[in-house]
C-alpha cells in the first residue's frame, strides 16, 4: 500500500521564500538528508541552478499539488529560467519517494547566450546523488 | 515472489538488548519501506517504525524512539530492528513487513527474569 | 493518537452468508493529498498478518472479489459477501494517515 509521499527537503542559504510548510519534517538526524513527508500532494520537486557546467542543488521538497510532470518516477530536470548571465535554474517533478534526491542527467539548457552542451553527466545506468 | 524472512527466536532479561533481522528477496529492497510492527501476547497489532533502505531515512511511533534503532544492509537485502533496555512488556512477536504489504513470519521475544 | 475502533469484537457467521465489519477513527483518515489511508489485514491462527484492502476499497492482489471495502472519512466497512472457511481469523483496520500508524483492536470471525 501507498505511504505518504515522502521527499528529501532542502532549502539553500538565501533562497527566497520556503516551501517547509507543504510537510512534516522527519527527524533524520544530521547524517542522513533531510526528509518532508508531503501534506497536499503526492509530488515532490527539485530544483538546480547549472553554472558553468556545475548543478548546485536550490531548493527539493514536496510540492503544493499534484500537476502534470507528478506522475513522472524519476526526476528529469527541465530548464525553466536564467537568474543570472550564464545561469540555468532546472526543476523536476515526480512521483517516487525521495525521487527528488538526484537527477540522471541535465538536458541542455537550449537557449540563446547559454552553452549547449549537457549539464554534470551520470555514467550509462547510474545517477547523480546531490551531496546535501 | 516477495519473501520476508526473519531471525530465529529470543529469550532475554530486563534490561537487555534485541537485535533482530529481516532478509528480504523477490524485489527490489531498495524501492520500499521496510515497517516493523509487534503482537503482544494474546494483544493487537502495534506499529513500532519504519525504514526507507535506499537513504536509511526512517520514522518512529513516538513511544519507541530512543529506545528502537532501524538499519538496513543494502548489500545482503536484510533489515534490522534492535529494541533496547528491554522490559517484561516487550514480550511480543515482532513482525517486518514490506510497507504492510508483505509481511515476515514473526520472530518471538521473550522478556523475563 | 488516533485511535481506531472496531465492531463487532466478535463475529459468529454461517458458511455461505455474508459479514460485514465497521471501523471508527477518532480522527478523519482522509489525508491533504485527497488520499485516505486506510487498510484491512486478516490474521490467520498461527500466521501472519496479510493485506487485504488498501486506500479504503482498493483489494491487494490475490485477495479474491468476496472481500470489498467502502467509507470515507471516519467510517469504513469491510464486507464478505460469502463466508468461506478460509475466512476464519482476526480482521484489523489500519491507519497510515496520521503517526503514529494505529490498528483496531481486531474482529473475530468464527464459523457458527
Known amino acids: 500500500p501507498p505511504n505518504r509521499r515522502t521527499c528529501v527537503f532542502f532549502e539553500a542559504p538565501g533562497v527566497r521564500g520556503s516551501t517547509k510548510t507543504l510537510g512534516e519534517l522527519l527527524d533524520t538526524g544530521t547524517e542522513l538528508p533531510r526528509a518532508i513527508r508531503c501534506l497536499y500532494s503526492r509530488c515532490c520537486f527539485g530544483i538546480w541552478n547549472l553554472t558553468q557546467d556545475r548543478a548546485q542543488v536550490e531548493m527539493q521538497g514536496c510540492r503544493d499539488s499534484d500537476e502534470p510532470g507528478c506522475e513522472s518516477l524519476h526526476c528529469d530536470p527541465s530548464p525553466r529560467a536564467h537568474p543570472s548571465p550564464g545561469s540555468t535554474l532546472f526543476t523536476c517533478s515526480c512521483g517516487t519517494d525521495f525521487c527528488n534526491a538526484n537527477y540522471s542527467h541535465l538536458p541542455p539548457p537550449g537557449s540563446p547566450g547559454t552553452p549547449g552542451s549537457q549539464g554534470p553527466q551520470a555514467a550509462p545506468g547510474e545517477s547523480i546523488w546531490m551531496a546535501l | 515472489q516477495v519473501q520476508l524472512v526473519q531471525s530465529g527466536a529470543e529469550v532475554k532479561v530486563p534490561g537487555a538488548s534485541v537485535k533482530m533481522s529481516c532478509k528480504a528477496s523477490g524485489y527490489t529492497f531498495t524501492d520500499y519501506w521496510v515497517s516493523w510492527v509487534r503482537q503482544s501476547p494474546g494483544q493487537g497489532l502495534e506499529w513500532i517504525g519504519e525504514i526507507y533502505p535506499k537513504n536509511g531515512v526512517s520514522n518512529f511511533n513516538e513511544k519507541f524512539k530512543g529506545r528502537v534503532t532501524l538499519t538496513v544492509d543494502k548489500s545482503t537485502s536484510t533489515a534490522y530492528m534492535e529494541l533496547r533496555s528491554l522490559r517484561s512488556d516487550d514480550t511480543a512477536v515482532y513482525y517486518c513487513t514490506r510497507q504492510r504489504d508483505y509481511w515476515g513470519q514473526g520472530v518471538l521475544v521473550t522478556v523475563s527474569s | 493518537d488516533v485511535v481506531m475502533t472496531q465492531s463487532p469484537l466478535s463475529l459468529p457467521v454461517t458458511l455461505g452468508q455474508p459479514a460485514s465489519i465497521s471501523c471508527r477513527s477518532s480522527?478523519?483518515?482522509?489525508?491533504?493529498?485527497?488520499?485516505?489511508?486506510l487498510e484491512w489485514y486478516l490474521q490467520r491462527p498461527g500466521q501472519s498478518p496479510r493485506l487485504l484492502i488498501y486506500?479504503?476499497?482498493n483489494r491487494f492482489s490475490g485477495v479474491p472479489d468476496r472481500f470489498s471495502g467502502s467509507g470515507s472519512g471516519t467510517d469504513f466497512t469491510l464486507k464478505i459477501s460469502r463466508v468461506e472457511a478460509e475466512d476464519v481469523g482476526v480482521y484489523y483496520c489500519f491507519q497510515a494517515t496520521h503517526d503514529p500508524n494505529t490498528f483496531g483492536q481486531g474482529t473475530k470471525l468464527e464459523i457458527k
Open positions: 480522527q478523519s483518515l482522509e489525508y491533504g493529498d485527497g488520499y485516505t489511508y
Open positions: 486506500g479504503v476499497s
